[in-house]
Amino acid sequence: LTCLGGFASPGPVPPSTALRELIEELVNITQNQKAPLCNGSMVWSINLTAGMYCAALESLINVSGCSAIEKTQRMLSGFCPHKVSAGQFSSLHVRDTKIEVAQFVKDLLLHLKKLFREGQFN
C-alpha cells in the first residue's frame, strides 16, 4: 500500500507555483529576521539576469550552518539545471562585491516578484 501511494503523488509543480513558493519562502525569511541573517555572513553579489537562479545558488551554497536559508538553497536547486557545489562560481557573480545574506535575499526577492508580475517563470 505504501508503494501504491506513490501513484497518487502530484506531477511536476507548474513553474508559476514553484516561483510563487520561492517568493513566499524569501518573504518568510525577511519577515522572521530577528538577529542578523546567517550571523551577517557575506556572499558574492550576482547579476540578476538569465541564469541567475544558478548564480544565486552558487553564492548561497557557500554559507554553511545557516538553517534559515537551507530551504531556499533546496528550492533554488530546483530552478538550476546543473549540480552546484560550494566553491563554484559563474560569470554572473559580481566578483568584487560581497553583500550580507540579508541584502542578497532582499534583492533576489524584489527581482523574483517582478518576474512573477511579468509572467516569467523559467
Partner: antibody
C-alpha cells in the same frame, strides 16, 4: 513621505520633441515600476508605457512605439518620458505614477498607487 | 488591445444612496500568473488620479470601506455603498494583465 514631482508645463512646435521628468522621493525607484499616463483635454486616461528602473526594461503601447522613450536614473531617483515627432493630438497632461513592491507580502503589486501632479504639454504652431 | 468598456458613462446619485459602475473587458484578463490585475481609479476635478481598488477587490490603504470591487474573467463592478458629496469625479477601470495595459473610458459620478 512618498512624492512624485514632475517638471513644468511645456509649449512645443509640431515635429519637435519633449522630455518630461518625474523626481521621486520617499522610496527607492529600483523597488518599483514607473509608468507614464496621459490625458488629452476633456478626455480619459491613456497608459503609454512603463519602465523597471532596476534594469531599464520597458513596455510601450504599440501606438507610441518608436516615438516614446521612457528612461530612469537610479542615482537621481528620476524617471523620464520623451515623446518625439510631436503633433497637435499630443497636447495633453502627462502623469508619472509608480507601482511599488514591498518585502512583506508574497504578492504585493500595488498598481499605480502614487501619481505625479501632471505636466501639461501643449503642441501648437 | 483589450478594450475596457464602462457603464454608465454618467451616474447621478443622491447622497446616502448606493452606486454601482460596471466594467467589461473585451477578453479575459486573468494574468498568466493567476492574478487578475483589474484596478479602479478616481480622478477628482483638477486632480491627479488616485488608486481605489487593485486586483479586483483589494482596497488600497486609506480608501473607505464604502468602496468595494468584485467580478472575474471579463465582468467587474465597483460599488459605493453610500455615496458622499466628496465622491464626485470620474471613475476609471484599468487592466494591467495584458500589454498594452488599458483604461476604461471613465464614468462621471455626480451628485443629484
Amino acid at each position: 513621505q512618498v512624492q512624485l514631482v514632475q517638471s513644468g508645463a511645456e509649449v512645443k512646435k509640431p515635429g519637435s520633441s519633449v522630455k518630461v521628468s518625474c523626481k521621486a522621493s520617499g522610496f527607492y525607484i529600483k523597488d518599483t515600476y514607473m509608468h507614464w499616463v496621459r490625458q488629452a483635454p476633456g478626455q480619459g486616461l491613456e497608459w503609454m508605457g512603463t519602465i523597471d528602473p532596476a534594469n531599464g526594461n520597458t513596455k510601450y503601447v504599440p501606438k507610441f512605439q518608436g516615438r516614446v522613450t521612457i528612461t530612469a536614473d537610479e542615482s537621481t531617483s528620476t524617471a523620464y518620458m520623451e515623446l518625439s515627432s510631436l503633433r497637435s493630438e499630443d497636447t495633453a497632461v502627462y502623469y508619472c505614477a509608480r507601482s511599488i513592491f514591498d518585502d512583506y507580502h508574497y504578492d504585493d503589486y500595488y498598481a499605480m498607487d502614487y501619481w505625479g501632479q501632471g505636466t501639461l504639454v501643449t503642441v501648437s504652431s | 488591445d483589450i478594450v475596457m468598456t464602462q457603464s454608465p458613462l454618467s451616474l447621478p446619485v443622491t447622497p446616502g444612496e448606493p452606486a454601482s459602475i460596471s466594467c467589461r473587458s473585451s477578453q479575459n484578463i486573468v494574468h498568466i500568473n493567476g492574478n487578475t490585475y483589474l484596478e479602479w481609479y478616481l480622478q477628482k476635478p483638477g486632480q491627479s488620479p488616485r488608486l481605489l481598488i487593485y486586483k479586483i477587490s483589494d482596497r488600497f490603504s486609506g480608501v473607505p470601506d464604502r468602496f468595494s470591487g468584485s467580478g472575474s474573467g471579463t465582468d467587474f463592478t465597483l460599488k459605493i455603498s453610500r455615496v458622499e458629496a466628496d465622491d464626485v469625479g470620474i471613475y476609471y477601470c484599468f487592466q494591467g494583465s495584458h500589454v498594452p495595459w488599458t483604461f476604461g473610458q471613465g464614468t462621471k459620478l455626480e451628485i443629484k
